[in-house]
């Protein structure tokens, strides 16, 4: 393990608050939670809750912890090594191509298709024809039967930020 | 002593390029973080970029993001600022500095940059 | 980002007499990143205070920073001719890194 430097091995002008964890950079990098001094001499812990860095790493600035928006709910928080990690509330999904908002599920498929995949925080319903069995492209149809469906079980985070 | 002298200065066109560099000397370059800070005639101070030692780590001001790029050569102690698409707003000194975030403590002379047709 | 704000935009003061500027954050400052700079016309800046507090190398101890927050201030306990000139707070808590837009002290 690194050793703690300590304030008086430090240049003059690049000491930092007492208040933070310092330990040795290998090899010009440093560890998971951390991010590099500016005189490169030493790593400084990242501050909970607040900022995060998952790699080894010479960053100047930990990384901003996301904060998750409303429509969304907050599956695990950010540690040090690890940013939040946020998913759209039942009933509504994040998709690849617009990740900045939670959109709503269908609550069914337009006419001649049948449901085969639920809606989950990561994707919506799916639908397919009922004859050949091909992927409705899934735009919002203009007429919906009257088949609903339930929210699927989160299985995963959809959007795992960092 | 801890020197560092920019070069690359000069009048270029609304949409064209330049390319400042940094020599310091006086310090062991690879393991600092450098920056660039520049001043518009008349005007304050202005971050324009900063880099990690081993020049792994970069940032930007939002202002000259997609168009600067800083980078660093470690066995000449050389820092970089490619600059393209220059604007008008661009036009200034730019001055190099070691440090980046505690403070900058050490600045260069700086190079002007003239940015006009 | 991090906006600083710093007042007054000029002080007229005599040799002698005490000088207080204020550097105030948007968002909260940690103090290991708050650094005061002095610029005099055509030169470059000179680093006065890093830590918001720390003395740089060779500054003269009529110089002196404190503050925590959002609230900062450089003092300079009497001005000497050579101390009136532009002056610059400057943070680094948290990208982009920023200046303040200046405190001129000026001769009265």
């Known amino acids: 393990e690194s050793a703690l430097i300590t304030q008086q091995d430090l240049a003059p002008q690049q000491r930092a608050a007492p208040q933070q964890k310092r330990s040795s950079p290998s090899e010009g990098l440093c560890p998971p939670g951390h991010h590099i001094s500016e005189d490169g001499r030493d790593c400084i812990s990242c501050k909970y809750g607040q900022d995060y860095s998952t790699h080894w790493n010479d960053l100047l600035f930990c990384l901003r912890c996301t904060r998750c928006d409303s429509g969304e709910v907050e599956l695990s928080p950010c540690t040090t090594t690890r940013n939040t990690v946020c998913q759209c509330e039942e009933g509504t999904f994040r998709e690849e191509d617009s990740p900045e908002m939670c959109r709503k599920c269908r609550t069914g498929c337009p006419r001649g298709m049948v449901k085969v995949g639920d809606c989950t925080p990561w994707s919506d319903i799916e639908c397919v024809h009922k004859e050949s069995g091909t992927k409705h492209s899934g735009e919002v149809p203009a007429v919906e039967e009257t088949v609903t469906s339930s929210p699927g079980t989160p299985a995963s985070p959809c959007s795992l930020s960092g | 002593e801890v020197q560092l002298l920019e070069s690359g200065g000069g009048l270029v066109q609304p949409g064209g390029s330049l390319r400042l560099s940094c020599a310091a000397s006086g310090f062991t370059f690879s393991s600092y973080a450098m920056s660039w800070v520049r001043q518009a005639p008349g005007k304050g101070l202005e971050w324009v970029s900063a880099?990690?030692?081993?020049?792994?780590?970069?940032y930007y001001a939002d202002s000259v993001k997609g168009r600067f790029t800083i980078s660093r050569d470690n066995s000449k102690n050389t820092l970089y600022l490619q600059m393209n698409s220059l604007r008008a707003e661009d036009m200034a000194v730019y001055y190099c500095?070691?440090?980046?975030?505690?403070?900058?403590?050490?600045w260069g002379q700086g190079t002007l940059v003239t940015v006009s047709s | 980002e991090i906006v600083l704000t710093q007042s007054p935009g000029t002080l007229s003061l005599s040799p002698g007499e005490r000088a207080t500027l204020s550097c105030r954050a948007s968002q909260s400052v940690s103090s290991s990143y708050l650094a005061w700079y002095q610029q005099k016309p055509g030169q470059a800046p000179r680093l006065l205070i890093y830590?918001?507090?720390s003395r740089a190398t060779g500054i003269p101890d009529r110089f002196s920073g404190s503050g925590s927050g959002t609230d900062f201030t450089l003092t300079i306990s009497r001005l000497e001719p050579e101390d009136f000139a532009v002056y610059y707070c400057q943070q680094g808590s948290q990208p982009p890194i920023t200046f303040g837009q200046g405190t001129k002290v000026e001769i009265k």
């Open positions: 830590g918001a507090s």
């Open positions: 880099i990690s030692g081993s020049g792994g780590s970069t």
């Open positions: 500095a070691k440090g980046a975030r505690v403070s900058f403590d050490y």
